[in-house]
C-alpha cells in the first residue's frame, strides 16, 4: 500500500481543523478489506475506517494490466453487460488473474432496446 499522502481534503471528521491530509487506506490484515486511513492536521491526528476492495486492489490496480474485448450485448434480465479482459502485463510479484470479467449496468437506451427485443421474441 502506497505511503504517499493523498491530496489535502477539507474538514476532517468531527473537527474544527480546516485542512486534513489523509493517508492511504491501510487494510488491517493482508492487502485488502477493512482497514484504517490516518489523517493529520497540525498536531491533531485522526483514524477513520475504510475499505480496500479486494478485486480492485489485486486485479484492477497498476499491478495488473488487461487487454479488454468490446462490451457484450445488454442482458435484459440483469440489466448489465459484460466484457472479458486477458492479462497483458503483471508486476513481477503480482498474482494477477489470467482473465477477468467486468460487468456494468446498461445505459437506459440499451436497456430499453434489450427489453423491446425480449418482448418481440415472446410474441
Amino acid at each position: 500500500v502506497a505511503k504517499k499522502k493523498d491530496k489535502v481534503k477539507k474538514g476532517g471528521p468531527g473537527s474544527e481543523c480546516a485542512e486534513w491530509a489523509w493517508g492511504p487506506c491501510t487494510p488491517s490484515s493482508k492487502d485488502c478489506g477493512v482497514g484504517f486511513r490516518e489523517g493529520t492536521c497540525g498536531a491533531q491526528t485522526q483514524r477513520i475506517r475504510c475499505r480496500v476492495p479486494c478485486n480492485w486492489k489485486k486485479e484492477f490496480g497498476a499491478d495488473c494490466k488487461y487487454k479488454f474485448e468490446n462490451w457484450g450485448a445488454c442482458d435484459g434480465g440483469t440489466g448489465t453487460k459484460v466484457r472479458q479482459g486477458t492479462l497483458k502485463k503483471a508486476r513481477y510479484n503480482a498474482q494477477c488473474q489470467e482473465t477477468i470479467r467486468v460487468t456494468k449496468p446498461c445505459t437506459p437506451k440499451t436497456k430499453a432496446k434489450a427489453k423491446a427485443k425480449k418482448g418481440k421474441g415472446k410474441d
Partner: antibody, heavy 117, light 107 residues
Framework: QVQLVQSGGGLVQPGGSLRLSCAAS????????MNWVRQAPGQGLEWIGM????????ILNQKFKDKATLTVDISKNTAYLQMNSLRAEDTAVYYC??????????WGQGTLVTVSS | DIVLTQSPATLSLSPGERATLSCRAS??????LHWYQQKPGQAPRLLIY???QSISGIPARFSGSGPGTDFTLTISSLEPEDFAVYYC?????????FGGGTKLEIK
Amino acid sequence: QVQLVQSGGGLVQPGGSLRLSCAASGQSFSSYWMNWVRQAPGQGLEWIGMIHPSDSETILNQKFKDKATLTVDISKNTAYLQMNSLRAEDTAVYYCSSWSAKRGDFWGQGTLVTVSS
Amino acid sequence: DIVLTQSPATLSLSPGERATLSCRASESISNNLHWYQQKPGQAPRLLIYYASQSISGIPARFSGSGPGTDFTLTISSLEPEDFAVYYCQQSNSWPLTFGGGTKLEIK
C-alpha cells in the same frame, strides 16, 4: 502450460558474440516475464536479466549491462539473449524461463555456451 | 544486492527421514522467496513460491515457511527422487539473486 525450446549455444572464440533463442509455445507468451539465468559448470545459478514481451521492458543485472542484450519477437513468440565480448568465464549453461507470480514458472532445457580458443 | 545464504551446504540423510533446509536473506524480503530443485543435467524446477505457496504438481511432502529473513524448506519424508541440489531465490528487489545451494545426498 508453456513450453520453451532453446537454441543457439555452441563453441565461441574469446571476444566473440552469440545470440541465444528461446521459442515459446502453449499459453500466451506475451503476458509473462522472460528471465535469463546461467549456470557455470559445477556452480550455482546466476540471474542475467528479464524482459516483458508486451512492451519490451527490460531489467538487467548490472553485472551484465555491457555484455547482455535482451530482445523479443512477438510475431515468432521468441525471446533472445545476445552475449558480446565473451570470455572463458562466460562458459555456462544458459536458461530461459517464463515467470508468472500466479502459476509459477516454466524453464527451457538450457543451452551450453563454451568460450574457448 | 540481497545475499541469500543457504545452510547446510551438504545434507546427508536417508529415505524416509525429514529434511530441513535453511535460507537466510541479508535483509527482509517479505515473502518474495522461492525454492528450486535441480538434478544433474536438468533445468531447475520450482517447488515452493512466495515462501510457502505450493505449486501445482509438486508433492505435498514439500513445504516452506517465511516471511522476513529466515526461510525453511521442509521435506517431510524423503523419497529416493528427492536427492538433488536445492536453491532459494529472492524476487524482492533487483537483481534477482540465488542462494549458493544445498546438496541433499543419500546417507
